[in-house]
């Protein structure tokens, strides 16, 4: 399977709401057997490899964002913590799952990360990632509402193995 | 290793722009935002802005707003600053700073400073 | 604008001794758990250079007599034993809210 994100850059108001998503493709196995591990965290534009460093988004790491549960179900996040942080991330039935922030600030900006990790026997099997980033904007050149920008396709499907 | 080379001082009547440059090197400008910050003789740091390198997004403080210009050109890892409608209180040395972010910014390189003298 | 407050103006300490500068932010600089507050010191006819970030952390290459402290509003940085090297101004400065802003300096003499 492989991650796509259907967009690469959202360019958003302060105070705004956004929702950053990616989309699992490729046959997924659905077998009793087999979980998917998503979840979310920030990085830094200049690794080598893009998505390597995992650094907490609003103070809750990869781990507290995380989703576990098997092919193609729906899951949210733990409510309580992440929506104390104005967070809450979501996977629905058809492969996407997204991250909403709430009520940003300039200290959102930055290059967000999805990841996947497919689990079988409770061993980690495979893992892909995705990357999109977020700007956000303040004073008289920003837009009113957010505003995304289309991965191009071939960036949008050709994601690295983490 | 990381270096921000800036263009030398200025000398500018009252009305007149500058504009100042700042040369990175040692990393890829696009990989953080870059900041100008200056000093008046003998007085505290004042932060302007900062640009966004990758897509050229700026942020000014409110005081400078109508005034100050930040542009870059990655071909040549430069960043600019220009300020219009010099006046005497814009005497000053003007640095750029790039950020680094864990898990926010801060200014971790600043260059050498470009004295810029506003005088009639 | 956040207005930073910093005390004292001045410092004049022996070698060896400990020295402290305090740093008032007018409001919270505080997100989500973090404080972004830094400290750069601005050797005479040099750049500032960052010594402390996110409140604590202290920036590599600088050395571990300089520690931070404070959240909230308070913020501190210490010197355990001053060295000649040292001399300069002291500047904390926030990054919670633009425009970033600074404190008026905090300038550390020697005896």
């Known amino acids: 399977f492989k991650v796509a994100t259907p967009y690469s850059l959202y360019v958003c108001p302060e105070g705004q709401n956004v929702t950053l998503t990616c989309r699992l493709l490729g046959p997924v196995d659905k077998g009793h057997d087999v979980t998917f591990y998503k979840t979310w965290y920030r990085s830094s534009r200049g690794e080598v490899q893009t998505c390597s460093e995992r650094r907490p988004i609003r103070n809750l790491t990869f781990q507290d964002l995380h989703l576990h549960h098997g092919g193609h179900q729906a899951a949210n996040t733990s409510h309580d913590l992440a929506q104390r942080h104005g967070l809450e991330s979501a996977s629905d039935h058809h492969g996407n799952f997204s991250i909403t922030m709430r009520n940003l600030t300039l200290l959102d900006s930055g290059l967000y990360c999805c990841l996947v990790v497919e689990i079988r026997h409770h061993h980690s099997e495979h893992r892909v990632h995705g990357a999109m980033e977020l700007q956000v904007q303040t004073g008289k050149d920003a837009p009113s509402n957010c505003v995304v920008y289309p991965s191009s396709s071939q960036d949008s499907e050709n994601i690295t193995a983490a | 290793q990381v270096q921000l080379v800036q263009s030398g001082a200025e000398v500018k009547k009252p009305g007149a722009s500058v504009k100042v440059s700042c040369k990175a090197s040692g990393y890829n400008i696009k990989d953080t935002y870059m900041h100008w910050v200056r000093q008046a003789p003998g007085q505290g740091l004042e932060w302007m802005g900062r640009i966004d390198p990758t897509h050229g997004y700026v942020i000014y403080d409110p005081k400078f707003q109508g005034r100050v210009t930040m542009t870059r050109d990655t071909s040549t890892s430069t960043v600019y600053m220009e300020l219009s409608s010099l006046r005497s209180e814009d005497t000053a040395v003007y640095y750029c700073?790039?950020?680094?972010?864990?898990?926010?910014?801060?200014?971790?390189?600043w260059g050498q400073g470009t004295l810029v003298t506003v005088s009639s | 604008d956040i207005v930073m407050t910093q005390t004292p103006l001045s410092l004049s300490v022996t070698p060896g001794q400990p020295a402290s500068i305090s740093c008032r932010a007018s409001?919270?600089?505080?997100?989500?758990?973090?404080?972004?507050m830094q400290w750069y010191l601005q050797k005479p006819g040099q750049s500032p250079q960052l010594l402390i970030y996110d409140a604590f952390n202290v920036e590599s290459g600088v050395p571990d007599r300089f520690s931070g402290s404070g959240s909230g509003t308070d913020f501190t940085l210490k010197i355990s034993r001053v060295e000649a090297e040292d001399v300069g101004v002291y500047y904390c400065q926030q990054s919670r809210k633009v425009p970033w802003t600074f404190g008026q300096g905090t300038k550390l003499e020697i005896k």
């Open positions: 409001e919270s600089v505080e997100y989500y758990g973090t404080s972004l």
């Open positions: 700073a790039r950020d680094r972010f864990d898990p926010y910014w801060f200014l971790d390189v």
